[in-house]
């Protein structure tokens, strides 16, 4: 398939409201940029089950963002 148009967010739609903590391998946060004007929370699942976008407005996402920011700053 061809490349996607530039300026596109990585996630489609609002994202899932929650992911089982036991299924999470890692969490990545993409902050607003020229390509996407919103924060995106991407969850990598264990056992090669791919990735899911977490709704950044969900309680779980807010906790993850807080945790990551605490770790980084």
């Amino acid at each position: 398939f061809p490349m996607f148009k530039r300026g596109r967010c990585l996630c489609i739609g609002p994202g899932v409201k929650a992911v089982k903590v036991a299924d999470i391998e890692k969490a990545s946060i993409m902050y607003p940029s020229n390509n996407c004007d919103k924060i995106e929370v991407i969850i990598t699942l264990k056992e090669n089950k791919g990735q899911r976008c977490l709704n950044p407005k969900s309680k779980q996402a807010r906790l993850i963002i807080k945790k990551v920011e605490r770790k980084n700053f």
Epitope: F4, L10, P14, G15, R52, L54
Partner: nanobody, 126 residues
Framework: EVQLVESGGGLVQAGGSLRLSCAAS????????IGWFRQAPGKEREGVSW????????YYADSVKGRFTISSDNAKNTVYLQMNSLKPEDTAVYYC???????????????????WGQGTQVTVSS
Amino acid sequence: EVQLVESGGGLVQAGGSLRLSCAASGFTFDDYAIGWFRQAPGKEREGVSWISSSDKDTYYADSVKGRFTISSDNAKNTVYLQMNSLKPEDTAVYYCAAGAGLLIATIWTTQMYDYWGQGTQVTVSS
């Protein structure tokens, strides 16, 4: 109970048109991306088009670009696939699927979709 029900398939001559519908129930429509896939006899299931219910973002496979149009009516929880200038190679069973939390990089990965319809047959004769 979650349900995706496709309709609108049939037999059409090459160059003709069909409109497929995918009626969804049992989940929050706005949270999901709805994809259309197709499977021809002896071939793997392939992605055709998808739409994000929340922001109406769309994407098409190269093979259908300019011929197929996907749209959604959120009030009816229904996604439509308007298929014009049909070719014999479009012959397949067409399925709709719903996935939440999808990434643009994995929209054609069938395992990422949570719910599937039963399919509707589209046959294009030459």
